[in-house]
């Protein structure tokens, strides 16, 4: 995805813009948006970006708030690209088992698992 | 999801069973399975479990290898439950922005981002 700045810098800038525009964004006190109830964020990217779309449609555009939504759109593009890469390479069972073991290992150590 | 053991223990047991049965599982040298090319595993759960399904259909069942696939099926159920929880609570913008900030923060610090 051709972005002028690397994705990592894009994420940092977006966090800063989010803080800057928070007051403007929360002005709509009646709007309802799906909020995931757990911290395994990657599982919820679809809902997160749907929520961003709802928020954008209700926010007066212009200035750097437009930049915020542009950035979020580029982040979405990056994530969509990552999702595409989930199934692009078909490899031997050995490689798949390595990945599965890694996935379960990450789940074991890093996921917030409710009992 | 009613499982006899907590999900965290289930994951640990599954990792052990995966090591135990690795030789049996890699016996099929011609089989090709999609393997994600990045380490943001949570984005690829669909493909991972599709791959598990392919592997299961090609593996002679019986004994503890059956237990391995049963466990993996329970882990899938857990993840499906977590995915459902992504959109169940529609809250105010304030709560959504908290979650978005958290998501971007995790992306900033924990994701493996390719430039």
């Amino acid at each position: 995805i051709p972005t002028e700045i690397p994705t990592s810098a894009l994420v940092k800038e977006t966090l800063a813009l989010l803080s800057t525009h928070r007051t403007l964004l929360i002005a709509n006190e009646t709007l309802r948006i799906p909020v995931p109830v757990h911290k395994n964020h990657q599982l919820c990217t679809e809902e997160i970006f749907q929520g961003i779309g709802t928020l954008e449609s209700q926010t007066v555009q212009g200035g750097t708030v437009e930049r915020l939504f542009k950035n979020l759109s580029l982040i979405k593009k990056y994530i969509d690209g990552q999702k595409k890469k989930c199934g692009e390479e078909r490899r031997r069972v050995n490689q798949f088992l390595d990945y599965l073991q890694e996935f379960l290992g990450v789940m074991n150590t890093e996921w917030i698992i409710e009992s | 999801i009613p499982t006899e053991i907590p999900t965290s223990a289930l994951v640990k047991e599954t990792l052990a069973l995966l090591s135990t049965h690795r030789t049996l599982l890699i016996a099929n040298e011609t089989l090709r399975i999609p393997v994600p090319v990045h380490k943001n595993h949570q984005l690829c759960t669909e493909e991972i479990f599709q791959g598990i399904g392919t592997l299961e259909s090609q593996t002679v069942q019986g004994g503890t290898v059956e237990r391995l696939f049963k466990n993996l099926s329970l882990i899938k159920k857990y993840i499906d439950g977590q995915k459902k929880k992504c959109g169940e609570e529609r809250r105010r913008v304030n709560q959504f922005l908290d979650y978005l900030q958290e998501f971007l923060g995790v992306m900033n610090t924990e994701w493996i981002i390719e430039s």
Partner: antibody, heavy 111, light 105 residues
Framework: PGLVAPSQSLSITCTVS????????VHWVRQPPGKGLEWLGV???????DYNSALMSRLSISKDNSKSQVFLKLNSLRTDDTAMYYC?????????????WGQGTTLTVSS | SSLSVSAGEKVTMSCKSS????????????LAWYQQKPGQPPKLLIY???TRESGVPDRFTGSGSGTDFTLTISSVQAEDLAVYYC?????????FGSGTELEIK
């Protein structure tokens, strides 16, 4: 509660059965005599709360998952708080769906 | 408002919202319909503007999109005597309509 004097507080407990408060949200709705329904607030399955802004300063909702109980507290009661108070269950879904309602608790605010 | 109909007749009641209850992202309309019989708590009939709650007779149908919604009872029965409320599920607070009282002639 029955009859309560103005400026006092109201506390109502809604005890549920057949489902878990960790999976289902619970809403509170009231209905003044001979009038329509007014949504008061909700406690989500996750424990978060949202209130009708018209009552926000006087209303609080909490729960005890282990006892399957949801609590409504309304402070500084006024005569126009006289109503039937209902708790209602909202299943896990992105759509609001108050599929089971309690029989209601009558409150009369009068001096 | 109130409506008076004979048993067996078709009846439609409307609910108008001051703002759109349609989410353009997922094309869902966030509106529910309830029936309240005298001396009873409300009962859910329709959610998501058109999805009938399980156990609700198929003579009840919800339709509409955006700001205009309709509840239709295809053939009114004596037991349908009640007040019918719509409820906004799009934004806070989840306001109810003022209700339509259905009388059976």
């Amino acid at each position: 509660p029955g009859l309560v004097a103005p400026s006092q507080s109201l506390s109502i407990t809604c005890t549920v059965s057949g489902f878990s408060l960790t999976s289902y949200s619970v809403h509170w709705v009231r209905q003044p005599p001979g009038k329509g329904l007014e949504w008061l607030g909700v406690i989500w399955a996750s424990g978060g709360t949202d209130y009708n802004s018209a009552l926000m300063s006087r209303l609080s909702i909490s729960k005890d998952n282990s006892k399957s109980q949801v609590f409504l507290k309304l402070n500084s009661l006024r005569t126009d708080d006289t109503a039937m108070y209902y708790c209602a269950r909202d299943p896990p879904s992105s759509l609001l769906r108050l599929d089971y309602w309690g029989q209601g608790t009558t409150l009369t605010v009068s001096s | 408002s109130s409506l008076s109909v004979s048993a067996g007749e078709k009846v439609t009641m409307s609910c108008k919202s001051s703002q759109s209850l349609l989410n353009s992202g997922n094309q869902k309309n966030y509106l529910a319909w309830y029936q309240q019989k005298p001396g009873q708590p409300p009962k859910l009939l329709i959610y998501g503007a058109s999805t009938r709650e399980s156990g609700v007779p198929d003579r009840f149908t919800g339709s509409g999109s955006g700001t205009d919604f309709t509840l239709t009872i295809s053939s009114v029965q004596a037991e349908d005597l009640a007040v019918y409320y719509c409820q906004n599920d799009h934004s806070f607070p989840f306001t109810f309509g003022s209700g339509t009282e259905l009388e059976i002639k």
